[in-house]
Interface confidence: low
């Protein structure tokens, strides 16, 4: 689901198409209705519409299942621990929650793409807000993790000690608060719009062109560029420090967080490049023509799908890169499968029994 702006009455880039209380696909948006008819033509959208109908429901259904299982497993492993969570683990728990909440909305958008929005305006607002809250939260929490690691390693500052979790909790609350703020447009402007001609309803925004561009810029900057810049800056410094100190164990310990950040960049960069093209077309810096518009529509669908895959990717990364995660997951499964065989709950052979599975432990770097 790529939430963008449409008043659901105007065709693509054509005011006159406004004629037309029209139905645009959920991924193709027009401008506000106006009396100055016909400033540019509606573009034929058969390819992008059919592509969305075929591609998105299948993809979203798959991501829903994978995301729910994977992030559920991550949350279960983290919450099953008896010791206090490290700062990074706490952020990762929140990340798993954010990803889970995001994938929970995917079946709704799958139905919207395939048929129509059948869930009413209330759920349209909630699902849209949930979607964007968790889109932003995912990016910002990854930025928090990298900043935490940066302080911890580069400045040897343990901002979030294992003791009182107040700071990490406050940081997470601030992230969620900020995301709620970013999602205000969803609560205000999203609604289930019924199209009298097609007798179909879709969950869409209802505000003008300037709002559409502003929202896209916010998404690009707050949801991608800023977090990515923070991550890049922090990890560049961390790697420099670790390389200078020849800390091979430390470097190994950094694998997971670096891989998670690289995955974020790889998954979301294509989508945001497409959004950037769209912004440039909105602002008139790039000529808007029908061929380009159609390609952008399809590219948006494909790259947003790639972006949502990121929700399912983190658990896989933990499973394949994080040794401790695999061990704890195995133990959890054994415990669930054999509740009476307490002997199976042995700690793994690692010397640091309480070290974090996700990060460079504050005391030692044997966490992975």
């Amino acid at each position: 689901m790529v939430l963008e702006v449409s008043d659901h009455q105007v065709l693509n880039d054509a005011e006159v198409a406004a004629l037309l209380e029209n139905f645009s696909s959920s991924y193709d948006y027009g401008e506000n209705e106006s009396d100055s008819c016909c400033t540019s033509p509606p573009c034929p959208q058969d390819f992008s519409l059919n592509f969305d109908r075929a591609f998105l429901p299948a993809l979203y259904s798959l991501l829903f299942l994978l995301g729910l299982l994977g992030n559920g497993a991550v949350a279960a492993v983290l919450l099953s621990r008896r010791t206090a969570l490290s700062s990074t683990d706490t952020f990762l728990l929140h990340l798993a929650v954010a990803d889970t909440l995001l994938v929970l909305t995917l079946p709704l958008w799958a139905v919207d793409a395939a048929v129509q929005w059948v869930f009413g305006s209330g759920l349209c607002k909630v699902a849209g807000a949930l979607f964007n809250i968790n889109f932003y939260a995912g990016a910002l929490l990854l930025a928090c993790i990298s900043f935490d690691r940066y302080l911890n390693i580069v400045h040897a500052t343990q901002l979030y000690r294992r003791g009182p979790p107040a700071r990490v909790t406050l940081t997470c609350l601030a992230v969620w608060g900020l995301c709620l703020l970013f999602a205000l447009p969803d609560f205000i402007f999203l609604s289930a719009h019924h199209d009298e001609r097609l007798n179909a309803t879709h969950c869409q925004y209802n505000f003008p062109q300037v709002g559409r561009t502003a929202l896209r810029v916010l998404q690009l900057v707050a949801g991608f560029l800023l977090p990515l810049l923070v991550m890049a800056y922090c990890y560049a410094h961390i790697l420099a420090v670790l390389l200078v100190s020849r800390g091979q164990r430390r470097l190994r310990a950094m694998r997971l967080v670096v891989v998670v950040v690289v995955a974020f960049a790889l998954c979301w960069t294509p989508y945001h490049l497409v959004v950037l093209v769209d912004i440039l077309m909105d602002l008139g810096a790039l000529a808007r023509n029908c061929g380009r518009e159609s390609r952008v529509d399809v590219a948006k669908s494909v790259t947003s799908g790639l972006g949502y895959m990121h929700c399912c990717l983190n658990p896989l990364l933990y499973a394949f890169v994080g040794v401790k995660f695999r061990e704890r997951m195995w133990m959890l499964l054994l415990r669930l499968g054999c509740p009476n065989q307490r002997g199976l709950q042995r700690q793994p052979s690692s010397s640091r029994r309480d070290s974090s599975w996700s990060e460079t432990s504050e005391a030692s770097y044997s966490g992975l």
Epitope: Q9, L11, N12, A14, E15, V16, A17, A18, L19, L20, E21, N22, F23, S24, S25, E33, S36, C37, C38, T39, S40, P41, P42, C43, P44, Q45, D46, L49, E196, R197, L198, N289, C290
Partner: antibody, heavy 123, light 106 residues
């Protein structure tokens, strides 16, 4: 079969008024945006007005804005064009035309035209 | 307003001839639409989105072009193709039509 039948044309004096009608059949009238297009005696085609399928939105070129009003009665499957302050240059054959729907969008061209009704503005 | 200029205004062709009608726009347009009108009849949609033939239009017709220059081509002129052809743009307000090209049989 799509049919559009215009009526109401005639001879009017400059400054006078006239209302054209277009009876639609053979398709779901309420689903389509409709327009009036005129053809001058010199055979030039000019777009005159457009109305959205629900009747909420109307559009006009500057040449007729303020003088012509397009409307529709979806219960009667009928399109109207109320013309006032008529001028000699409004003399033309007036066609009612349907906007097609393509991939879920209305388009700016016309896929069906009526046979037309003639308006002559002359003193 | 975008002006559409059709050329030639009148064109005589023999059966079997390849015929090309031109439509030039005063500024760039995304698509051109073509209509055929025979004497005593209303216009009929002939080509939409520059190159798509309307239902029932023979395959000998084709449309092409981009930007400011568009054309309608008949690969092999037939008697029933004698008519006036109009181009139309929907890129900017108002909708405008070309002046028409009257295609006659020699």
């Amino acid at each position: 079969e799509v049919q559009l039948l215009e009526s109401g044309g005639g001879l009017v004096q400059p400054g006078g008024s006239l209302k054209l009608s277009c009876a639609a059949s053979g398709f779901t009238f309420t689903s389509y945006a409709m327009s009036w297009v005129r053809q001058t005696p010199g055979k030039r085609l000019e777009w005159v007005a457009t109305i959205s399928h629900g009747g909420t939105y109307t559009y006009y070129p500057d040449s007729v804005k303020g003088r012509f009003t397009i409307s529709r009665d979806n219960s009667k499957n009928t399109l109207y064009l109320q013309m006032s302050s008529l001028r000699s240059e409004d003399t033309a054959m007036y066609y009612c035309a349907r906007h097609p729907i393509y991939s879920g969008n209305y388009q700016g061209y016309f896929d069906y035209w009526g046979q037309g009704t003639t308006l002559t503005v002359s003193s | 307003d975008i002006q559409l200029t059709q050329s030639p205004a009148i064109l005589s062709a023999s059966v079997g001839d390849r015929v090309t009608i031109s439509c030039r726009a005063s500024s760039g347009v995304n698509y051109i639409y073509w209509y055929q009108q025979k004497p005593g009849q209303s216009p009929k949609l002939w080509i939409y989105f520059t190159s798509n033939l309307a239902p029932g239009v023979p395959a000998r017709f084709s449309g092409s072009g981009s930007g400011n220059s568009y054309s309608l081509t008949i690969s092999s002129m037939q008697g029933e193709d004698a008519a006036t052809y109009y181009c139309q743009q929907f890129t900017s307000s108002p909708y405008t039509f070309g002046g028409g090209t009257k295609l006659e049989i020699k």
